[in-house]
Amino acid sequence: ISCGSPPPILNGRISYYSTPIAVGTVIRYSCSGTFRLIGEKSLLCITKDKVDGTWDKPAPKCEYFNKYSSCPEPIVPGGYKIRGSTPYRHGDSVTFACKTNFSMNGNKSVWCQANNMWGPTRLPTCVSVFPLECPALPMIHNGHHTSENVGSIAPGLSVTYSCESGYLLVGEKIINCLSSGKWSAVPPTCEE
């Protein structure tokens, strides 16, 4: 079982390989000096049907370096960054993992593109492995709450409350959504 020639790349090069390309072979892409690689640089020859070989993902692309490009902080509810830090310049990558009891959908890594957007795929999503969700928490008088998403919230996520200036928070500042679908505490209050 073998793979066909790896997909070509404009303004870049492909690592050395010999033919036939055996299943398990890795080829690596890189870009010429003034270009930046967007996408996974390594492709793996795999077989899905034990008959034909195929490459496990599309080839990355080489974008002409844009020194003015910068991308916003990427947020994945239920996830956290394991690689990458601000500022995010053209060609920089960020890799995510999901919190405990969350599973990932999509590709774990994204790249800062010349158009100031993350790509070449969408940001991954972290989905709760528990079907239960906690109901949306109410806003509080003279205060606010921040949550990683809106509406009902998956177990493992939390909501942080704060009070407007001149008010004191009474109760729990951070409330966690438990795997039971219940909140770890009642909302606090803001008192003068």
Epitope: S15, Y16, G24, V26, R28, L44, I46
Partner: antibody
Framework: QVQLVQSGAEVKKPGSSVKVSCKAS????????ISWVRQAPGQGLEWMGR????????NYAQKFQGRVTITADKSTSTAYMELSSLRSEDTAVYYC????????????WGQGTLVTVSS | EIVMTQSPATLSVSPGERATLSCRAG??????LAWYQQKPGQAPRLLIY???TRATGIPARFSGSGSGTEFTLTISSLQSEDFAVYYC????????FGQGTKLEIK
């Protein structure tokens, strides 16, 4: 950080086989590649082959083709390397080493297993 | 297979001084090169990957450079714990290691 713990030292007779295990803890076993690298006494490092557990695909260095078999058990997060038709030149420390995805370089190594081939 | 050649076989340097280790590939390997440190009785430890990127937790005194066929590992100011054997490894086409350079105290 992923921890790789290998089985203990072995003494074998020429012509026999040896099977060394490498148990991984931390990280997702099936998403990375495990290579086997050996080091004869006072010598350098020699790549033998590698397996990608999620795919069950193993590839071998030309030198060891037909004599080495690398397998993985995803349920126990353990990789195995079996070397057959042992000869005295196979006396070495055998290491398992982990690549994150298919990066090509090894972030984590087992502690090594000494295999001595002697009559 | 791609042959990796390291030089010198042994390098004697005094603590606090700079050490420069070389690695040559038998054909172009782009930047697909890693450096490892190995101390007696221990497994190798990743220092550098992609020719010049320091691995997590590796001190800034270690730096890598080069691309194509010529690569260098530089240790800017040698500490006592840096005396060890250093290996380069290519991952352009499968995997091969250099024969190692022993860095010893002068």
């Amino acid at each position: 950080q992923v921890q790789l713990v290998q089985s203990g030292a072995e003494v074998k007779k020429p012509g026999s086989s040896v099977k060394v295990s490498c148990k991984a803890s931390g990280g997702t076993f099936s998403t990375y590649a495990i290579s086997w690298v050996r080091q004869a006494p006072g010598q350098g490092l020699e790549w033998m082959g590698r397996i990608i557990p999620i795919l069950g695909i193993a590839n071998y260095a030309q030198k060891f083709q037909g004599r080495v078999t690398i397998t993985a058990d995803k349920s126990t997060s353990t990789a195995y390397m079996e070397l057959s038709s042992l000869r005295s030149e196979d006396t070495a420390v055998y290491y398992c080493a982990r690549e994150d995805d298919i990066s090509g370089y090894y972030q984590d190594w087992g502690q090594g297993t000494l295999v001595t081939v002697s009559s | 297979e791609i042959v990796m050649t390291q030089s010198p076989a042994t390098l004697s340097v005094s603590p606090g001084e700079r050490a420069t280790l070389s690695c040559r590939a038998g054909q172009s390997i782009n930047s697909h090169l890693a450096w490892y440190q190995q101390k007696p009785g221990q497994a190798p430890r990743l220092l550098i990957y992609d020719a010049s990127t320091r691995a997590t937790g590796i001190p800034a005194r270690f730096s890598g450079s080069g691309s194509g066929t010529e690569f260098t590992l530089t240790i800017s100011s040698l500490q006592s714990e840096d005396f060890a054997v250093y290996y380069c490894q290519q991952y352009e086409y499968w995997y091969t290691f250099g024969q190692g350079t022993k860095l010893e105290i002068k």
